[in-house]
């Protein structure tokens, strides 16, 4: 419950939230579990902690491992674990299963595809969408906030959808991509 799997691609931004939630006023300390080394909070570091969030800007394959977050209230300390895996970028179009977020289902009346993890990032529109690596074009596709809406959904719309956006941190931009499968169900 308080261990969470997170994954990302090398040279992209990855932001992980401590699985152990606390009130906003509580302090959070992050450690690299294997070495018990404290994660710095200074933003000049490529990997740094920012309250409930652990930021990899950008991520490297060597960052993979288990990170411990300790949330501290005035009287209680509670621990969570983030199991982070950073993968090399694939040269071909296929997105392997281990990089896929949960599958969503849609129908003619409800065809929203939410861009996974986007709420953790400081992003601004536009949000780009791809299906099986092809940029989506045409009036049936509408990028709305953090969703993709498909009008008049058809069986052929099933497939793997990737959202791509830019995370901004102190004026520096980092790319993020996330992919999930979309299935079409009958009403």
């Amino acid at each position: 419950k308080f261990s969470k799997q997170s994954w990302g691609l090398e040279n992209e931004a990855l932001i992980v939230r401590c699985p152990r939630q606390g009130k906003p006023s509580y302090t959070v300390d992050w450690y690299y579990s294997q070495t018990n080394e404290s994660i710095p909070t200074q933003e000049r570091n490529r990997v740094f902690a920012s309250g409930q969030l652990l930021k990899f800007l950008p991520a490297a394959v060597a960052d993979s491992g288990i990170y411990t977050c300790i949330v501290r209230s005035p009287t209680f300390n509670r621990t969570g674990y983030a199991n982070v895996t950073i993968y090399k970028k694939q040269s071909d179009c296929n997105v392997p299963d281990y990089l896929m977020y949960s599958t969503v289902s849609g129908s003619e009346k409800n065809s929203k595809i939410y861009c996974p993890t986007i709420d953790l990032y400081n992003w601004t529109a536009p949000l780009e969408w791809f299906k099986n690596c092809q940029a989506l074009q045409g009036s049936r596709y509408r990028a709305h906030k953090s969703f993709l809406v498909i009008d008049n959904v058809m069986t052929e719309d099933a497939g793997d959808y990737t959202c791509k956006f830019i995370h901004n941190e102190n004026g520096a931009n980092y790319s993020v991509t996330a992919t999930r499968s979309f299935t079409v169900k009958d009403e």
């Epitope: 419950k1 308080f2 939630q21 606390g22 009130k23 209230s73 009287t75 209680f76 509670r78 621990t79």
Partner: antibody
Framework: EVQLLESGGGLVQPGGSLRLSCAAS????????MIWVRQAPGKGLEWVSS????????YYADSVKGRFTISRDNSKNTLYLQMNSLRAEDTAVYYC????????????????WGQGTLVTVSS | EIVLTQSPATLSLSPGERATLSCRAS??????LAWYQQKPGQAPRLLIY???NRATGIPARFSGSGSGTDFTLTISSLEPEDFAVYYC?????????FGQGTKVEIK
């Protein structure tokens, strides 16, 4: 120093009503979830009801659902339990307690308890 | 609802002895389990949270262990003030539930 002080207990006939209060001090009452727990004479502890902090979402044990109402007045630092249609099996010491951590959708332990107020339901 | 079963119901021991109390959950509660101590005429007092962490001000002789469905509270060497009733409580989901209690009495 955190303090919780219950009041409002007493003897009431079956089918009657009672309103318990819990005055809180020594902490920022509005941000904490608050809980009522009861203990029948010589028995164990039973969770009765919880109320979220500023959001005010409420939860009830099946045994009291529809009869008891938990509420709070953050401006008065006071927790309430309105008890209607009381039964003999509601006879217990009623404690109010603080959940020092919980976030929306989760619960935690009870770190501070009041001294309790006795409710006796009998004819 | 999650049922917590404590054993034994009563534990008769002498001061200085080790007390081992058990709490078993009807389904997994991860580490969302607490232990409380209650003395006659008093409100319960929190001892252990998240299965194994001592609450502020609780002596080191109290320790908790376990995860999932099986938990243990250990008092390494009983002091006279430790004779009381002990309850476990799960907080993974509502309704919050308590065990029926274990009474630790003087032998």
């Amino acid at each position: 120093e955190v303090q919780l002080l219950e009041s409002g207990g007493g003897l009431v006939q079956p089918g009657g009503s009672l309103r318990l209060s819990c005055a809180a001090s020594g902490f920022t009452f509005s941000i904490y979830d608050m809980i009522w727990v009861r203990q029948a004479p010589g028995k164990g502890l039973e969770w009765v009801s919880s109320i979220r902090g500023e959001g005010g979402g409420t939860y009830y044990a099946d045994s009291v659902k529809g009869r008891f109402t938990i509420s709070r007045d953050n401006s008065k630092n006071t927790l309430y339990l309105q008890m209607n249609s009381l039964r003999a099996e509601d006879t217990a010491v009623y404690y109010c307690a603080r959940d020092p951590w919980s976030t929306e959708g989760s619960f935690f332990v009870l770190d501070y308890w009041g001294q309790g107020t006795l409710v006796t339901v009998s004819s | 609802e999650i049922v917590l079963t404590q054993s034994p119901a009563t534990l008769s021991l002498s001061p200085g002895e080790r007390a081992t109390l058990s709490c078993r959950a009807s389904q997994s509660v991860d580490d969302d389990l607490a232990w409380y101590q209650q003395k006659p005429g008093q409100a319960p007092r929190l001892l252990i949270y998240d299965a194994s962490n001592r609450a502020t001000g609780i002596p080191a002789r109290f320790s908790g262990s376990g995860s999932g469905t099986d938990f243990t509270l250990t008092i390494s060497s009983l002091e006279p003030e430790d004779f009381a009733v002990y309850y476990c409580q799960q907080y993974i989901t509502a309704p919050l539930t308590f065990g029926q209690g274990t009474k630790v009495e003087i032998k």
